[in-house]
């Protein structure tokens, strides 16, 4: 009696796929040992076809996979493009040899069934419409026409030309003739359900002179497409239900006990468990749409179905498409904070992981909006202008090679609360969702800038100070000038010796920035911030206005300004004559196809709906110049 368990008999037809799940006892050794699938030969030898060590036989090349799910103590063998040659005896097992623990599986692959010559085979998916063609001779042109369904020896009338319709086919079956044709009638059966499958006989006339045609109707249940995704990654369900439901409401549901629970539909319904991490995007006018879910959780695994019906809810007899989603807990995507908290007037630094192999990919940050199907307008990107309303308070700092980039948002308000997505134009799996929670501030901010009404005069020296608490003593302080393509750190030099943090004087912790001489282009937003290496912390922002010197205004000697700066022993004076170049560059057209509709160039197309202008500024965010 083997402790391995699986399906003893698997049967399918040529061209299909099978997915065989084998269950093993939950032990540490079993979870990590080799898993295999082998074919039993007449000589008793079991030839490996695929194993978890990476082995793949020639006959399975390009059509099979073996995936271990240690958290479920299962492994799955997927085999596609079946042929009758695949019929045979197999073993799924584990161990370093094929003699270890195993389970015997019999696989039988049949030909697509054939019927007698006079039988027309109709194969349709659930929810679709079939048109059965019935030929007759001229002598029966004026006779009664009918379609019946065989049940054992009997044939029960479905519909006839006297306008009788079987109650179970009411509003679904119609009998008609096309144009002037006098030798053929048709029966349409719409909204097909599994029990419609079977043998039908259409008849024109009565008795021995009647014309009869046999029709075999096969109603196919949707074959779930298997999707294997990593924990914390994203999945896209591409749904193409056909033109006939183009104008009906669309939905995605998840099968649960006796129902299929709607996750999202085009009528505005959305499951709270997917709040902030789901988007439904119409693809075209033919009823195609896609649903993107980010931040996959273990509990997201299961059977999903998309469909269409005016109610936005699943209905029997309406077309559907199905998937089975597996979520693998052995994920390459690092665990990052899903909730970030901030206070009004303060700032947050959000770390966005991305595939380290794609350091040159374009990085984006968008705000998930709940309206209707959900959308995610881009707020900032490595080559995207900062969205209106975020000027001076939002920047993206890329850290090439680190596998992460940082987005800083300051001057927070409670309106900033909500869900945000980190994404790139590269690997579509690396999409992270962050919930930002902004609470009312109960104390003064950690960083304070003086003077708060900053107006600099052209040609003069202007110094602005940033006061920081002792807790930031050991961190790197910086000033940067904000522009549409990031916040470029200004050069700094340390003035005076640092005192030990033990004797830190709370009132004298200041980092200053000096503009000398002030130029018109110095006008704009400046940030004071703290960081430790690549890890960004608190920031605060101030707008520096620049005006012409008015006649009679006192001219400040630059040396006096510097002298002022030297008075504060803990000041780190930063002097800047840096000029920001704002070279405009065109956005990658692959990335913003429909205004700013995010498009994944590698995998699925235009995965989330976004809006805004498509301008851009070149340059690397966050670099010191």
């Amino acid at each position: 009696q083997s402790p391995i368990f699986g399906p003893q008999d698997v049967s399918s037809i040529e061209g299909n796929s099978v997915s065989i799940t084998c269950y093993y006892p939950d032990t540490s050794v079993n979870r990590h040992t080799r898993k295999y699938w082998c074919r039993q030969g007449a000589n008793g030898y079991c030839a490996t076809l695929i194993s978890s060590n990476g082995y793949l036989s020639k006959e399975y090349s390009g059509r099979a996979s073996l995936i271990n799910f240690p958290e479920n103590s299962t492994f799955v063998i997927n085999i596609a493009h079946l042929t009758q040659e695949d019929t045979g005896s197999y073993k799924c097992g584990l161990g370093t040899t094929n003699r270890g623990l195993f389970f015997d599986v019999s696989l039988e692959v049949s030909q697509v069934p054939e019927f007698p010559n006079d039988t027309h085979v109709y194969t349709k998916d659930i929810g679709r419409t079939v048109t059965i063609e019935c030929r007759f001779k001229e002598g029966n042109a004026h006779s009664k026409k009918s379609l019946c369904k065989k049940r054992g020896e009997a044939c029960e009338v479905v519909i006839d030309s006297t306008e009788y319709v079987d109650p179970s086919y009411k509003d679904r079956a119609i009998l008609f003739m096309k144009g002037t044709s006098r030798d053929i009638f048709y029966v349409n059966i719409s909204h097909l359900i599994p029990s419609d499958a079977g043998l039908y006989v259409c008849q024109a006339g009565e008795g021995p002179s009647a014309d009869k045609n046999n029709a075999d109707l096969q109603v196919l249940e949707p074959e779930p497409e298997l999707l294997y995704k990593d924990l914390r990654s994203s999945v896209t369900f591409e749904c193409d239900l056909g033109r006939e439901v183009a104008n009906d409401a669309k939905y995605l549901c998840r099968k649960n006990k006796e129902t299929c629970d709607v996750i999202i539909n085009t009528l505005g319904k959305r499951d709270p468990a997917f709040e902030g991490r789901i988007l439904l995007t119409p693809r075209d006018d033919n009823g195609r749409f896609s649903v993107l879910i980010t931040g996959l959780r273990k509990e997201d695994a299961g059977h999903y179905q998309c469909g269409a019906h005016s109610s936005g809810l699943p209905q029997e007899g309406w077309p559907v498409q199905a998937w089975q989603l597996f979520v693998n807990e052995e994920s390459t995507i690092p665990n990052s904070r899903s909730v970030v908290k901030g206070v009004t007037g303060g700032s947050v630094a959000i770390v966005c992981p991305y595939n380290p192999k794609e350091s040159s990919s374009l990085k984006y940050w968008c705000h998930w909006e709940a309206d209707e199907n959900g959308r995610c307008p881009v707020l900032v990107g490595t080559q995207a202008l900062v969205q209106e309303g975020y000027e001076g308070r939002l920047a993206l700092f890329d850290q090439p090679g680190s596998g992460a980039y940082t987005v800083i948002l300051n001057q927070l308000t409670t309106q900033d609360s909500g869900f945000y997505w980190c994404l790139t134009d590269g690997d579509s799996r690396w999409r992270t969702t962050i919930e930002l929670q902004v609470a009312e501030a109960t104390k003064k901010p950690d960083l304070e800038v003086t003077p708060q009404n900053a107006t600099a005069v052209i040609g003069e020296t202007f110094t602005i100070s940033c006061h920081y608490p002792c807790k930031f003593y050991s961190q790197e302080k910086y000033w940067c000038k904000w522009s549409n393509d990031g916040c470029h750190i200004l050069p700094s030099h340390d003035e005076g010796a640092r005192q030990s943090s033990v004797s830190c004087d709370q009132s004298s912790q200041i980092v200053s920035m000096t503009l000398n001489p002030v130029k018109k282009e110095d006008e704009g937003w400046y940030w004071c911030g703290v960081k430790e290496g690549q890890v960004y912390g608190e920031t605060t922002a101030i707008y520096v206005a620049v005006e012409e010197r008015t006649r009679g205004s006192p001219h400040i000697n630059p040396t006096d300004a510097n002298a002022r700066a030297k008075d504060a022993p803990e000041e780190e004076a930063m002097e800047s004559s840096v000029r920001e170049d704002e070279n405009k560059a065109n956005l990658d057209p692959r990335l913003f196809a429909d205004e700013r509709e995010i498009q994944n160039a590698g995998d699925q197309a235009q995965e989330n709906r976004a809006s805004g202008n498509a301008g851009s500024a070149g340059g690397q965010s966050g670099s010191s110049k």
């Epitope: 008999d9 049967s11 399918s12 037809i13 249940e221 099968k255 649960n256 029997e316």
Partner: nanobody, 126 residues
Framework: EVQLVESGGGLVQAGDSLRLSCAAS????????MGWFRQAPGKEREFVAT??????????YYADSVKGRFTISRDNAKNTVYLQMNSLKPEDTAVYYC?????????????????WGQGTLVTVSS
């Protein structure tokens, strides 16, 4: 709501055969598996056999105690599952329950099934 109705139970001699039927009606939209469990007097309900399907592919699972003797099958058009029981033994005596559901996980686990029939008694005398 899905309704399951079992039939075909009865009293037979050891070594005889019996065929159980389970007809499903109602919203079978989310059903991807149907199976049989049994419960002998004073014992826990145990897995017997399950058939799972995906389009035109069928997967049949059996308990070790019935392998080679019992065969599960289904008639898609009739929404009915059958259990053909051959070479019956006295230890096969039990109430046989039909179960149905999405059966995403291990088919031997009772919780994988969302609907249950009332049961049909099979008595095998020696």
């Amino acid at each position: 709501e899905v309704q399951l109705v079992e039939s075909g139970g009865g009293l037979v001699q050891a070594g005889d055969s019996l065929r159980l039927s389970c007809a499903a009606s109602g919203r079978t939209l989310t059903t991807y598996g149907m199976g049989w469990f049994r419960q002998a007097p004073g014992k826990e309900r145990e897995f017997v056999a399950t058939i799972k399907w995906s389009g035109s592919t069928n997967y049949k699972y059996y308990a070790d105690s019935v392998k080679g003797r019992f065969t599960i099958s289904r008639d898609n058009a009739k929404n009915t599952v059958y259990l053909q029981m051959n070479s019956l033994k006295p230890e096969d005596t039990a109430v046989y329950y039909c179960a149905a559901g999405t059966v995403l996980g291990d088919p031997r686990v009772l919780n994988e099934y969302d609907y249950w029939g009332q049961g049909t008694l099979v008595t095998v005398s020696s």
